[in-house]
Interface confidence: medium
């Protein structure tokens, strides 16, 4: 049966928590990703940014989970208008910012 949206969001949050807490060396070798506008379409925008990071096992589960939240197919090199123009940040900072934002969505009861 389908996972309830609240459970799926909790699981995504848990995964991001694990990433931030288990970080020893620089996450994804310090790879940089496009910063995104967190105010709308956050799941697809986050996936569009993170999907361009390859060979980083630490975020593979996050990529798969985000894919489950995003209603359309996302492929590498694809960018929506939600990207913050010409601003790149380290994956570690991206994950931390995304985690706080998703917790705020959870706090609002916004599970979709």
């Amino acid at each position: 049966s389908p996972v309830p949206p609240s459970t799926a969001l909790k699981e995504l949050i848990e995964e991001l928590v694990n990433i931030t807490q288990n970080q020893k060396a620089p996450l994804c070798n310090g790879s940089m990703v496009w910063s995104i506008n967190l105010t709308a379409g956050v799941y697809c925008a986050a996936l569009e940014s993170l999907i361009n990071v390859s060979g980083c096992s630490a975020i593979e589960k996050t990529q798969r989970m985000l894919n489950g939240f995003c209603p359309h197919k996302v492929s590498a090199g694809q960018f929506s208008s939600l990207r913050v123009r010409d601003t790149k940040i380290e994956v570690a900072q991206f994950v931390k910012d995304l985690l706080v934002h998703l917790k705020k969505l959870f706090r609002e009861g916004q599970f979709n």
Partner: antibody, heavy 122, light 108 residues
Framework: QMQLVESGGGVVQPGRSLRLSCAAS????????MHWVRQAPGKGLEWVAV????????HYADSVKGRFTITRDNSKNTLNLQMNSLRAEDTAVYYC???????????????WGQGTMVTVSS | SYVLTQPPSVSVAPGETATITCGGN??????VHWYQQKPGQAPLLVIY???DRPARIPERFSGSNSGNTATLTISRVEAGDEADYYC???????????FGGGTKLTVL
């Protein structure tokens, strides 16, 4: 400097009413959610009520719902708490607290008043 | 309503590390804030959004949050850290702000 100053506390008999006020200064009052938090003597912190920045939404702790009313006047930078049908268990220091708002939930309490004491006793 | 559980007291020697826990069902999905309250004073925010420190709060104060437990850690504890500490979350189910019962930190 940013400041919250409570007033209106005192001794009141059970069943009577009291109105607390909080004067805000040094920040854009109308852009913040405002809360009341209380602390009974020797006890922990208890959240009482919140009112959103524009006054459109209020929420109350179960222990005060139907008896307390939180209001604000953004033109005067004031927060109020009307307390009716007071009980002995309402005896506490009442703090006026500022919290940034994120849509319809509250962020951390980043500015507190010094508190005003309310004693409910016959 | 959501329930946050803290140990009533924690004791630590000066210079050591104090760990104060805050338990709640899947608290790792919530943003947790921590407050310090000294006798006769209003509470002071020391950690917000699980891990962030307001300006003027020493780096000795840090937070973490995962699973069913959030933690406030105070390293190199000083006598001035002796106070009551409270955790807090916003519960979206009840639209209530919820405090833990508080932990009294004693510096031996």
């Amino acid at each position: 400097q940013m400041q919250l100053v409570e007033s209106g506390g005192g001794v009141v008999q059970p069943g009577r009413s009291l109105r607390l006020s909080c004067a805000a200064s040094g920040f854009a009052f109308r852009t913040y959610g405002m809360h009341w938090v209380r602390q009974a003597p020797g006890k922990g912190l208890e959240w009482v009520a919140v009112i959103w920045d524009d006054g459109s939404n209020t929420h109350y702790a179960d222990s005060v719902k139907g008896r307390f009313t939180i209001t604000r006047d953004n033109s005067k930078n004031t927060l109020n708490l009307q307390m009716n049908s007071l009980r002995a268990e309402d005896t506490a220091v009442y703090y006026c607290v500022r919290a940034p708002q994120w849509y319809l939930s509250a962020e951390a309490f980043d500015l507190w008043g010094q508190g005003t004491m309310v004693t409910v006793s016959s | 309503s959501y329930v946050l559980t803290q140990p009533p007291s924690v004791s630590v020697a000066p210079g050591e590390t104090a760990t104060i826990t805050c338990g709640g069902n899947m608290i790792g999905a919530y943003l947790v804030h921590w407050y310090q309250q000294k006798p006769g004073q209003a509470p002071l925010l020391v950690i917000y959004d699980d891990v962030d420190r307001p300006a003027r709060i020493p780096e000795r104060f840090s937070g973490s949050n995962s699973g069913n437990t959030a933690t406030l850690t105070i390293s190199r504890v000083e006598a001035g850290d002796e106070a009551d500490y409270y955790c807090q979350v916003w519960d979206h189910n009840s639209d209530h702000m919820v405090f833990g019962g508080g932990t009294k930190l004693t510096v031996l």
